[in-house]
C-alpha cells in the first residue's frame, strides 16, 4: 500500500529563516515625519528584507533612516536574502504575480516592474518606496523570470483536467484521486509564525505549513516575518494555492485551491519543512 510507505521530502534550500534583526529599530516602519522637505533616505523593509528608498520630510521620524544604501545594509541586513521558490515550468507563477500594481503609501518615485495579469507582461511602474506588495521587481528581467508565461499556454494533467494559463482555472471533471504535489508558493508561507519585537496584541493569521491551514496568532505590532495576514482569506489566497502537481512526464501543473464554485480537487502529498 503506497500510502503506508512514506517519503519525506525535506525542503532545505527554499526555507526562509525567521527574521533576526541586528537592531530593533530596523523593524520600524518608514517614517517621513511631519515636515515637508523631500530628502532621499533609506530604510530597512522587514517585509522584503531589503533596504529601500523613501522620502524623508526632514524632521522627527525614527531610527530606521539612513543616509545611504550601504549604511542601511550595514546596520540592518544579514546574509539571509528572501528567496522566491522558482517553479519548474515558466507558466507556474507565484501568487503575488496576480496582485495589482501597488505603489504603496510613500512619496518616493522609484522605477520598478510589476507583472500585469491583463496584458500578461511585465511593465514599469512608479513605486513610492514603502509598503506595496510582492509584485514589485527591481529589474524587468527579474519580473519576467518569475512571472511571465513560458511558451505553452496550458498543460493537461494525467486526469484530463485542463489548466488554463490565462485565468489559472481548472476545468472540473469528477472526484479526483491523489497525486504528488510540491510547494511552489511564496517562501515565507513555509516560515513559522513570528510575533515580532513589540508589545501589541494584534489578531493576525499565519499559514501553518505542517497542517496546511491558516491559523490565528497574536502579532506584536512590529518585526516578525511575511507569514502574517490580517485575514484568514488573505492568508489562504497567498499560501494555500502554491502547490504544484508533479505529473509523470516530469512537468508541473499548478492547481488553485480555494476558488469559488470549484467542486473538484486533487489531493496533496506531504512536504516537510526542516526545523518547523
Amino acid at each position: 500500500d503506497s500510502e503506508e510507505d512514506e517519503e519525506h521530502t525535506i525542503i532545505t534550500d527554499t526555507e526562509l529563516p525567521p527574521l533576526k534583526l541586528m537592531h530593533s529599530f530596523c523593524a520600524f516602519k518608514a517614517d517621513d515625519g511631519p515636515c515637508k522637505a523631500i530628502m532621499k533616505r533609506f530604510f530597512f523593509n522587514i517585509f522584503t528584507r531589503q533596504c529601500e528608498e523613501f522620502i524623508y520630510g526632514g524632521c522627527e521620524g525614527n531610527q530606521n533612516r539612513f543616509e545611504s544604501l550601504e549604511e542601511c545594509k550595514k546596520m540592518c541586513t544579514r546574509d539571509n536574502a528572501n528567496r522566491i521558490i522558482k517553479t519548474t515550468l515558466q507558466q507556474e507563477k507565484p501568487d503575488f504575480c496576480f496582485l495589482e500594481e501597488d505603489p504603496g503609501i510613500c512619496r518616493g518615485y522609484i522605477t520598478r516592474y510589476f507583472y500585469n495579469n491583463q496584458t500578461k507582461q511585465c511593465e514599469r511602474f512608479k513605486y513610492g518606496g514603502c509598503l506595496g506588495n510582492m509584485n514589485n521587481f527591481e529589474t524587468l528581467e527579474e519580473c519576467k523570470n518569475i512571472c511571465e508565461d513560458g511558451p505553452n499556454g496550458f498543460q493537461v494533467d494525467n486526469y484530463g483536467t485542463q489548466l488554463n494559463a490565462v485565468n489559472n482555472s481548472l476545468t472540473p471533471q469528477s472526484t479526483k484521486v491523489p497525486s504528488l504535489f510540491e510547494f511552489h508558493g511564496p517562501s515565507w508561507c513555509l516560515t513559522p509564525a513570528d510575533r515580532g519585537l513589540c508589545r501589541a496584541n494584534e489578531n493576525r493569521f499565519y499559514y501553518n505549513s505542517v497542517i496546511g491551514k491558516c491559523r490565528p496568532f497574536k502579532y506584536s505590532g512590529c518585526g516578525g516575518n511575511e507569514n502574517n495576514f490580517t485575514s484568514k482569506q488573505e492568508c489562504l489566497r497567498a499560501c494555500k494555492k502554491g502547490f504544484i502537481q508533479r505529473i509523470s512526464k516530469g512537468g508541473l501543473i499548478k492547481t488553485k485551491r480555494k476558488r469559488k464554485k470549484q467542486r473538484v480537487k486533487i489531493a496533496y502529498e506531504e512536504i516537510f519543512v526542516k526545523n518547523m
Epitope: K176, I211, G212, K265
Partner: antibody, heavy 118, light 107 residues
C-alpha cells in the same frame, strides 16, 4: 507502516483522573500534528483537540479546556491525554488520529474505552 | 463554533440503490469537508478528504460534491458492505466539528 497504538481500556471512579497514551510508529513523529476524538457509546464523534509533537503546542476545543490536557514525549513518540474530574459523561471511546496535510485524518488508533463508574 | 447539520440521521436503502447524505455548514468552509465511514468496533475510515478528493483504495462508487456551506455525499449502487455509519467533518475552522452521523442500513 504508520501505526497509532493506544493504551488499554480503563475503568475509573467518578472524580478521578486517567491518562491515555497513543504511541506512533512508522513515520517521522514530529512532522504531523496529533488529534484526539471522543465517541460516546452509540453516539457521534467529537473533536477534543490537537497537539504539535515538535513543540508541544496545543489547541483545545473550548468544551474540553477544563477536562483534557494534551502532552507529548518525543523520546518515545507518544502523545498523552489526561482527563480529569471524571463523570459518567466522560465514558466513551477516545481515539488519537494523525492529521495529514490536505488529506485529513487518514490514520487512527484503535481507540481506548474509558468507563466511569462507582 | 461552526455547526454541521447532517441529514438524514438514518437511511434504509436496497442493494444497488443510490444513497445521498447531506451536510449543511453554518459558515462558509470553502471545500474543507471530509467524509468518514465507521463500522461497529472500528475507528472511522476516511473516504473523501478536503476538496472532494477520493482517498486511495476507496471504490469509485463513493463521491462527494459541494462548496461553501452545502455538501452532498453519494454512494452509487450500494453494496451490503457499505452498511455503516457515515460522518462529515469540517476541517476549515477550529474547533473541527463532525456532523451527527447517518446510519445506513439495507432495506
Amino acid at each position: 507502516q504508520v501505526q497509532l497504538q493506544q493504551s488499554g481500556a480503563e475503568l475509573v471512579k467518578p472524580g478521578a483522573s486517567v491518562k491515555l497514551s497513543c504511541k506512533a510508529s512508522g513515520y517521522t513523529f514530529i512532522s504531523y500534528y496529533m488529534y484526539w476524538v471522543k465517541q460516546r457509546p452509540g453516539q457521534g464523534l467529537e473533536w477534543i483537540g490537537e497537539i504539535n509533537p515538535s513543540n508541544g503546542d496545543t489547541n483545545l476545543n473550548e468544551k474540553f479546556k477544563s477536562k483534557a490536557t494534551l502532552t507529548v514525549d518525543k523520546s518515545s513518540s507518544t502523545v498523552y491525554m489526561q482527563l480529569s474530574s471524571l463523570t459518567s459523561e466522560d465514558s466513551a471511546v477516545y481515539y488519537c488520529t494523525r492529521w495529514d496535510r490536505f488529506d485529513g485524518f487518514v490514520y487512527w488508533g484503535q481507540g481506548t474505552l474509558v468507563t466511569v463508574s462507582a | 463554533e461552526t455547526t454541521v447539520t447532517q441529514s438524514p440521521a438514518s437511511l434504509s436503502m436496497a442493494i444497488g440503490g443510490k444513497v445521498t447524505i447531506r451536510c449543511i455548514i453554518s459558515t462558509n468552509i470553502d471545500d474543507d469537508i471530509n467524509w468518514y465511514q465507521q463500522k461497529p468496533g472500528e475507528p472511522p475510515k476516511l473516504l473523501i478528504s478536503e476538496g472532494n478528493t477520493l482517498r486511495p483504495g476507496v471504490p469509485s462508487r463513493f463521491s462527494s460534491s459541494g462548496y461553501g456551506t452545502d455538501f452532498v455525499f453519494t454512494i452509487e449502487n450500494m453494496l451490503s458492505e457499505d452498511v455503516a455509519d457515515y460522518y462529515c467533518l469540517q476541517s476549515d475552522d477550529l474547533p473541527y466539528t463532525f456532523g451527527g452521523g447517518t446510519k445506513l442500513e439495507i432495506k
